[in-house]
């Protein structure tokens, strides 16, 4: 959480970002927020990328002014008009690229003064990992396949009965480039696995970290997915 | 002098439909959301939904939704909110004011009487 | 939705002494709160919005505090046009929601 506070000239007001990660191809939320201030015509919106010329986007008198807007953002922003009212001053990003990431500020002018705030942009591809009982296998075998993931995470597993047992020896992975030559298919497969034990596949990188759990017995087997985004620092 | 005029009271039949008029000054209107609150005899406020015609976009309590509509007229600088299938608990004084987030003007209040 | 409580429902105080009256939050808004007047016959006045700043033409006596749940709005040196009813209003997020209102009373 980063939050900053206006200089010099009228009241400094304050503004609050949360440093946040981007699904490369998919859309994505900037958070910022502000004090609201119920003379809507006098809000300015500004959102700055660091070393980038343009502007990544502008609101101001109630809709977008994207004159100045850098041509790598092109129609790909927005804020939500009806949460300005309240503060809301977040930025959608659509089809989010590699090099989005970067250091953005958000700068905010209200009738009561100014302020802005920095935000930490990430970008990379993660997505929930399944884990299913691999049938084909000569041994009681599990698979772990997540579709996309950039850059190349870490695939550890672990196990419920076994805790703190290293599965390393026991298992294998590999990274499947995808069609689009940036993300990978990751596959990871447990060899040798017990029943009436719950078995966890977890993928992290220095973006997101995932968990899919399942759990075999003789009459059914349960599964369960986790995602959580790294370094959602508020600022 | 900022002022919301509202239109004037109303008996009306269950069932039936209401319409509550708010002129305001032509800065108001261009500057401002302009926002309904009604108050139930004896009871607390409730914030009924609101038009920014700057943002041009309009919310509504979930409470109201379906049964609510709010509309502004730049031309004239007058806002309405019209409220379908009216029941006795609809009985209220209806106001309009200037804002959100917050409300730091207040038209007279429009008393609104759904009684067969 | 967040809903808004205040305490007491009435409060009796004589005149010259402070009144404090509270509201409660069931979430954090911040400081995106504000308090109105109402006397009976009235539209609601604005008091106080941001939590603690005074809307335009409030006396100083006339105070606002507290962030995230908790709040208070306190009158010190009550006067007879002081007597009303208070009620809080968040407006952290859609919708927004007033407090019941503390009805404040000549003692």
């Known amino acids: 959480l980063i939050i900053g506070f206006g200089i010099s000239g009228r009241h400094s007001i304050t503004v609050t970002t949360v440093a946040s990660a981007g699904n490369i191809g998919e859309d994505g939320i900037l958070s910022c927020t502000f004090e609201p201030d119920i003379k809507l015509s006098d809000i300015v919106i500004q959102w700055l990328k660091e070393g980038v010329i343009g502007l990544v986007h502008e609101f101001k008198e109630g809709k977008d002014e994207l004159s100045e807007q850098d041509e790598m953002f092109r129609g790909r922003t927005a804020v939500f008009a009806d949460q300005v009212i309240v503060g809301n001053a977040s930025l959608r990003l659509k089809n989010v690229q590699l090099t989005d990431a970067g250091t953005y500020k958000c700068y905010i002018i209200t009738s009561k003064g100014k302020g802005n705030a920095n935000l930490e942009y990430k970008t990379g591809a993660f997505s929930m990992p399944e884990v299913n009982v691999d049938y084909n296998a000569s041994s009681e075998t599990l698979r772990c396949e997540a579709p996309r993931w950039f850059p190349q995470p870490t695939v550890v597993w672990a196990s419920q009965v076994d805790q703190g047992a290293n599965f390393s020896e026991v298992s294998n992975t590999s990274f499947e480039l995808n069609s689009e030559n940036v993300t990978m298919k990751v596959v990871s497969v447990l060899y040798n696995v017990t029943i009436n034990n719950t078995y966890s596949c977890m993928i992290e990188n220095d973006i997101a970290k995932a968990t899919g759990d399942i759990k075999v017995t003789e009459s059914e087997i349960k599964r369960r997915s986790h995602l959580q985004l790294l370094n959602s620092k508020a600022s | 002098q900022v002022q919301l005029v509202q239109s004037g009271a109303e008996v009306k039949k269950p069932g039936s439909s209401m319409r509550v008029s708010c002129k305001a000054s032509?800065?108001?209107?261009?500057?401002?959301?302009i926002s309904w609150v009604r108050q139930a005899p004896g009871q607390g406020l409730e914030w009924m939904g609101g038009?920014?015609?700057?943002?041009?976009?309009?919310n509504y309590a979930q409470k109201f939704q379906g049964r609510v509509t709010i509309t502004a007229d730049k031309s004239t600088s007058t806002a309405y909110m019209e409220l379908s299938s009216l029941r006795s608990e609809d009985t209220a004084v209806y106001y309009c004011?200037?804002?959100?987030?917050?409300?730091?003007?207040w038209g007279q209040g429009t008393l609104v009487t759904v009684s067969s | 939705e967040i809903v808004m409580t205040q305490s007491p429902a009435s409060l009796s105080v004589s005149p010259g002494e402070r009144a404090t009256l509270s509201c409660r939050a069931s979430?954090?808004?911040?400081?995106?709160l504000a308090w109105y007047q109402q006397k009976p016959g009235q539209a609601p006045r604005l008091l106080i919005y941001?939590?603690?700043t005074r809307a335009t033409g409030i006396p100083a006596r006339v105070s606002g505090g507290g962030s995230g749940t908790e709040f208070t709005l306190t009158i010190s040196s009550l006067q007879s046009e002081d007597f009303a009813v208070y009620c809080c209003?968040?407006?952290?997020?859609?919708?927004?929601?007033f407090g019941p209102g503390t009805k404040l009373e000549i003692k």
């Open positions: 004011a200037r804002g959100g987030p917050y409300f730091d003007y």
């Open positions: 032509e800065d108001t209107f261009s500057s401002y959301a």
């Open positions: 038009t920014a015609p700057i943002f041009g976009t309009t």
């Open positions: 979430q954090s808004v911040s400081s995106n």
């Open positions: 941001g939590a603690s």
């Open positions: 209003q968040q407006y952290k997020n859609w919708p927004f929601t």
